[in-house]
């Protein structure tokens, strides 16, 4: 969480950003809020990116003003125009690319004053893992699969019964490059599993951490997956029995945006 204050002139306003991560090939959200103003026409929002000459986005007098927009962002950005009046300056970014990573500045001008805050935006690929019993295997085996990750993550297995145990000797992990030659499919197999135990497959890179749990008993199989963006207040949970999902702004695009 970064809170910035305006420093020029007598008046300053508080601007708040949240470091977040973008999933390449999907929508991203750059989160920014500010002290609201009662008049939309008095609000100016400027998004800038370190190392980019043109603007990422500008919104003023109640509408987008894109004459100074850098070409790399053309047709890829929008603010939530109906939420600007309540202090939401967050930016929607289309088709996140690896090159979108960097330091962004959310700069706000209102009738109350000026303010800005920086935001670190990471880009990569991350996805929910799914753990299943591998019935094709000769012994009791679990298979953990996640379709899209980048950079290459680490995979660690854990179990509720054997806490602290090292499963590296009885597991095998492979990374298969996807057709677009950037992201990779993660497949990890755990051998010699026992019944009435909960196993967790944990996948992590510097952007996200995801866990897939499976509990196998005589009568049923329960699954649960969890994805958390690192350095960001966002997480998503899915269970095969009970599905719960929630999001703060940084994860919103993976849930509901076009």
């Amino acid at each position: 969480l970064i809170i910035g204050f305006g420093i020029s002139g007598r008046h300053s306003i508080t601007v708040t950003t949240v470091a977040s991560a973008g999933n390449i090939g999907e929508d991203g959200i750059l989160s920014c809020t500010f002290e609201p103003d009662i008049k939309l026409s008095d609000i100016v929002i400027q998004w800038l990116k370190e190392g980019v000459i043109g603007l990422v986005h500008e919104f003023k007098e109640g509408k987008d003003e894109l004459s100074e927009q850098d070409e790399m962002f053309r047709g890829r950005t929008a603010v939530f125009a109906d939420q600007v009046i309540v202090g939401n300056a967050s930016l929607r970014l289309k088709n996140v690319q690896l090159t979108d990573a960097g330091t962004y500045k959310c700069y706000i001008i209102t009738s109350k004053g000026k303010g800005n805050a920086n935001l670190e935006y990471k880009t990569g690929a991350f996805s929910m893992p799914e753990v299943n019993v591998d019935y094709n295997a000769s012994s009791e085996t679990l298979r953990c699969e996640a379709p899209r990750w980048f950079p290459q993550p680490t995979v660690v297995w854990a179990s509720q019964v054997d806490q602290g145990a090292n499963f590296s000797e009885v597991s095998n992990t492979s990374f298969e490059l996807n057709s677009e030659n950037v992201t990779m499919k993660v497949v990890s197999v755990l051998y010699n599993v026992t019944i009435n135990n909960t196993y967790s497959c944990m996948i992590e890179n510097d952007i996200a951490k995801a866990t897939g749990d499976i509990k196998v008993t005589e009568s049923e199989i329960k699954r649960r997956s969890h994805l958390q963006l690192l350095n960001s207040k966002a997480s998503l949970c899915v269970s095969s029995f009970l599905a719960i999902s929630w999001a703060l702004l940084p994860l919103a695009p993976y849930l509901m945006l076009k």
Epitope: G25, E26, D27, H57, K63, D64, E65, L66, S67, Q69, R74, G75, R76, T77, A78, A81, R92, K94, N95, N178, S179, E180, V182, T183, L257, K258
Partner: antibody
Framework: EVQLVQSGAEVKKPGASVKVSCKAS????????IGWVRQAPGQGLEWIGD????????NYNEKFKGRVTITRDTSTSTAYLELSSLRSEDTAVYYC??????????????WGQGTLVTVSS | DIQMTQSPSSLSASVGDRVTITCKAS??????VAWYQQKPGKAPKLLIY???TLQPGVPSRFSGSGSGRDYTLTISSLQPEDFATYYC?????????FGQGTKVEIK
């Protein structure tokens, strides 16, 4: 309600040019991209290009580059498609469509009624 | 340029059937695939965008799925008004591209 009303049918000779108009209403014209798509008789949809009326920025299908020009008149909330050096294979229904997502180029969510352009000697 | 290869080009089905239409992108990967329905003499109608999001007012029997380069439109139980031509659209890149279309006819 978003409405896109296109100009009437045109008959042109090979080598000539045609200019089709698309008048928008029911939303802020300068805030949404407008695209153009054509459909030859019995054929599929073909994307031609689009324009952001707020700044006049355009994108074109490589196939039409040099022959197509997309413009707009913000005072009348109208977008235009001009196609030059017409040939018989340009005979098609030409559609304009609003792109969803405001300054973000989204999918085409509202369409005009179409304009039939016939190229015949 | 990205090409969208749509299949099949046509299919015959009966009311109540489950129908699946696929589109494959020639390269790249993103979730920006939309599906349209078009009836003769009419403009296309947006059904689904961002791979799987249903456009307001579109019946829930229509659904979309996919990732990477492969995308699918499914009609769970075909209704008489669903006989039409369907197109996919890739809109993630600078240049948009439609699939060739799939005509769904009455068996």
């Amino acid at each position: 309600e978003v409405q896109l009303v296109q100009s009437g049918a045109e008959v042109k000779k090979p080598g000539a040019s045609v200019k089709v108009s698309c008048k928008a209403s029911g939303y802020t014209f300068t805030s949404y991209w407008i695209g153009w798509v054509r459909q030859a008789p019995g054929q599929g949809l073909e994307w031609i290009g689009d324009i952001y009326p707020g700044g006049g920025y355009t994108n074109y299908n490589e196939k039409f580059k040099g022959r197509v020009t997309i413009t707009r008149d913000t005072s009348t909330s109208t977008a235009y498609l001009e196609l030059s050096s017409l040939r018989s294979e340009d005979t098609a229904v030409y559609y304009c469509a609003r792109l969803d997502g405001s300054s973000y180029r989204g999918a085409m969510d509202s369409w005009g009624q179409g304009t039939l352009v016939t190229v015949s000697s | 340029d990205i090409q969208m290869t749509q299949s099949p080009s046509s299919l015959s089905a009966s009311v109540g059937d489950r129908v699946t239409i696929t589109c494959k992108a020639s390269q790249g990967f993103n979730k920006y695939v939309a599906w349209y329905q078009q009836k003769p003499g009419k403009a296309p109608k947006l059904l689904i965008y961002y791979t799987s999001t249903l456009q307001p007012g579109v019946p829930s029997r229509f659904s979309g799925s996919g990732s990477g380069r492969d995308y699918t439109l499914t009609i769970s139980s075909l209704q008489p008004e669903d006989f039409a031509t369907y197109y996919c659209l890739q809109y993630g890149n600078l240049l948009y591209a439609f699939g060739q279309g799939t005509k769904v006819e009455i068996k």
